[in-house]
């Protein structure tokens, strides 16, 4: 083992932006940071055969298999895949290491298999074996974490039944509101499954794996906080565990906490209490109400009472199936070109939704914010004043929801013209949709005031570009106007725009644009 490591094998994952078959390359594209594949000498192999850790790749992902050799000078190499030789161009990095790369763009089943790399340097020969397979993500799951009490201990265990095994972390915050945002300095993260410090203001548990990250907040009633104007509501599905924490701080230990469901004390075994002294010698008590697997009859008002604080309640609603409640009627908006505006959807949902905003076949990330009344809101402001159709889509394990929005931007028309041997057409995308006039320019009417009404055909909104309407007007050519200049004008409440067209023989037409506000 004293001759290790002379070579380093790495996997580089790329952000997809191209498609091709595997190709040998010395300069891969922009990428994520390299992952060490720990090339180890293959036991019981004749010669110097190194084996990289197996590589699992998502379908359509782009990767680079890379080998770094600490052998400057002349090196030659050859890739072999499925009995075919692939060309190989080594280069040297700043540190004089030989670099050999194999880029696999848009991974497919045909590109999975064993990649053999033969390297010949002045000093030694190396054979490196990479095994690349397609990751079976169909079997992957990421479930929202839930809480369990640790046996014989005052501690909570966070569980997420996910594949692959997720990394579980507790996210703790002792501040209020905005300062408990994920990246705030007030937030402390603990990458462990068991939590003993249960007195904090805000406690969440998150689980993450290749599919993403899911979090569950420990539902808390704080008797020292002013109650919300609307009763806090907690939704659960039948069979899920219920956890509610009641927290109270008092100048001394002379107070107690109790839980009631619909005015009946909770049964023993459905609650446990913890207490501690805070830094200023006040007493903090917390009382957990929990049901390991809820049924419909666990629905109701859970009230936490204290001998020294006003009691507070939460409504627990047990549902058979998840839901998304929101109005799905489409909404149309009309705004000025520089007006600040955001689309917003207010909804109530359980379990928490995953959502996207879509415009012009492009998806945008979707943020949700919880409101005090149990509703959540998602806003989209990144429309860059582009008119058209915007779609909000939300889903959870049990429900789906889609809502359509149309955005119209008030602006004066812009006219485009085209002509053929038999007709001239003008198009405009202004809003409100413009009206059209055609005028003939002649010796009698050098200012083009002679209106043309014959042979004009207006089509309102004949072409819908991602919800953006385009209006057009067509003038059929007649002997009376052939050889003349004609002017088409589009006008709406914000202004007028015109194009002048010379109606002669077919071919490229000269267009003169007039802008009249």
């Amino acid at each position: 083992n004293q001759d290790l490591p002379v070579i380093k094998c790495v996997l580089i994952n790329h952000k997809n932006n191209d498609s091709s078959v595997g190709k040998s390359s010395s300069y891969p594209m922009v990428s994520e940071s390299p992952e060490d594949l720990g090339c180890a000498l293959r036991p019981q192999s004749s010669g110097t055969v190194y084996e990289a850790a197996a590589v699992e790749v998502d379908v359509s992902a782009s990767i680079t298999l890379q080998v770094l050799v600490d052998a400057p000078g002349n090196i030659s190499c050859l890739w072999v895949f499925k009995h075919s030789s692939l060309n190989c161009q080594p280069h040297f990095d700043l540190q004089n290491r030989g670099v050999v790369s194999m880029v696999i763009l848009k991974m497919t089943e045909t590109q999975a298999g064993e990649y053999l790399l033969f390297i010949q340097s002045e000093a030694t020969n190396y054979t490196i074996l990479f095994t690349v397979s397609i990751r079976n993500t169909l079997l992957y799951t990421l479930r929202r974490p839930y809480f369990r009490k640790m046996e014989n201990q005052d501690a909570l265990v966070c569980i997420s039944e996910s594949v692959p095994e997720p990394i579980v972390e507790w996210v703790l915050c002792d501040s209020q509101g905005e300062s408990c945002k994920e990246e705030s300095p007030a937030v402390v993260k603990k990458e462990e499954k068991v939590l003993h410090e249960l007195f904090g203001t805000d406690i969440r548990c998150c689980a993450r794996n290749e599919l993403g990250r899911e979090c569950t907040r420990l539902f808390t009633i704080d008797l020292n906080q002013t109650p919300q104007t609307t009763l806090p509501q907690l939704f659960l599905k039948v069979g899920e565990p219920l956890w509610i924490r009641c927290k109270a701080v008092h100048v001394n230990h002379g107070f107690g906490l109790t839980w009631e469901l619909e005015n009946k004390a909770l049964e023993e075994g459905n609650y446990f209490e913890m207490s501690t002294y805070s830094t200023n010698r006040t007493m903090i008590r917390i009382l957990f109400a929990f049901v390991s697997s809820v049924a419909r009859n666990d629905t109701g008002y859970y009230t936490c009472s204290s001998s020294k604080h006003p009691s507070q309640s939460a409504l627990v609603t047990i549902v058979e199936k998840g839901f998304i409640n929101a109005t799905n009627s489409s909404e149309d908006y009309e705004i000025d070109q520089y007006e600040e505006f955001c689309f917003s959807v207010r909804f109530k949902a359980y379990p928490q939704i995953r959502c996207t905003w879509t415009f012009s076949r492009k998806s945008f990330p979707c943020e949700q914010k919880g409101l005090d009344n149990g509703y959540s809101i998602s806003k989209f402001c990144n429309h860059k004043h582009q008119p058209g159709e915007y779609i909000f889509h939300a889903e959870n394990d049990d429900a789906q929801f889609t809502k359509m929005f149309t955005l119209n931007i008030r602006r004066k028309p812009q006219v485009l013209a085209e002509a053929s041997a038999s007709q001239a057409s003008c198009f405009s995308d202004g809003y409100p949709l413009p009206s059209w006039t055609w005028k003939k320019c002649s010796d009698k009417s050098p200012n083009c005031t002679e209106e043309i009404t014959e042979g004009v055909w207006n089509r309102k909104a004949n072409r819908k570009v991602f919800g953006q309407w385009v209006s057009s007007s067509t003038l059929n050519m007649s002997e009376a106007i052939k050889g003349f200049l004609v002017k088409c004008c589009a006008y709406n409440s914000l202004g007028t725009s015109c194009e002048t067209i010379l109606l002669n023989s077919p071919g490229p037409f000269p267009f003169i644009q007039d802008n009249i506000s």
Partner: antibody, heavy 118, light 106 residues
Framework: EVQLQESGAELVKPGASVKLSCKAS????????INWLKQRPGQGLEWIGN????????NYNEKFKNKATLTVDTSSSTAYMQLSSLTSDDSAVYYC???????????WGQGTTLTVSS | QIVLTQSPAIMSASPGEKVTMTCSAS?????MHWYQQKSGTSPKRWIF???KLASGVPVRFSGSGSGTSYSLTITNMETEDAATYYC?????????FGGGTKLEIK
Amino acid sequence: EVQLQESGAELVKPGASVKLSCKASGYTFTNYWINWLKQRPGQGLEWIGNIYPGSTIINYNEKFKNKATLTVDTSSSTAYMQLSSLTSDDSAVYYCARRVVYLYFDSWGQGTTLTVSS
Amino acid sequence: QIVLTQSPAIMSASPGEKVTMTCSASSSVSYMHWYQQKSGTSPKRWIFDTSKLASGVPVRFSGSGSGTSYSLTITNMETEDAATYYCQQWSSKSPTFGGGTKLEIK
């Protein structure tokens, strides 16, 4: 076991030259870069340069280009560093170290103390 | 040349205490390596590729960071951990070292 054995302490006069040695054992000498580093008392480490015994490719830190000369003798698996035109600024502990492909130094010599004094 | 700045230059900790020292690079580097050096001895490789422990290094040591900011942490300081720790990068043509953090026992 990988070992780098450096030559003993040197006391030399200003203006003179000195040749330090580093004998490698326990691995294939021609497969790894030998690096030389300088450490003044109570100070950090400075990289002087490196040499690849397999093809005698040499790199120098710009600062030491006119100060150090690196050579190897593959038959005895020994690397050498000659320091010329010595001044009191060259008084330091000099280490040879083996570089691995991960770009760190995995094995170090015990160091040679060089004192330049009249 | 990439300059590495280690802080603090000197620190002391009691046994059992958590210790964190940092290494800041003047421009972004791919990996950071760490060495431990005790008085009168040569440096020992300690952490490589930012977070991998060299063989024989106790698991109470850990390394992390990216870009221009890296750190070495000891979860439970022990007396044998008293030493000077150097960070090192080789993302540029020449490798450079930080000035070292001297960790003393309280």
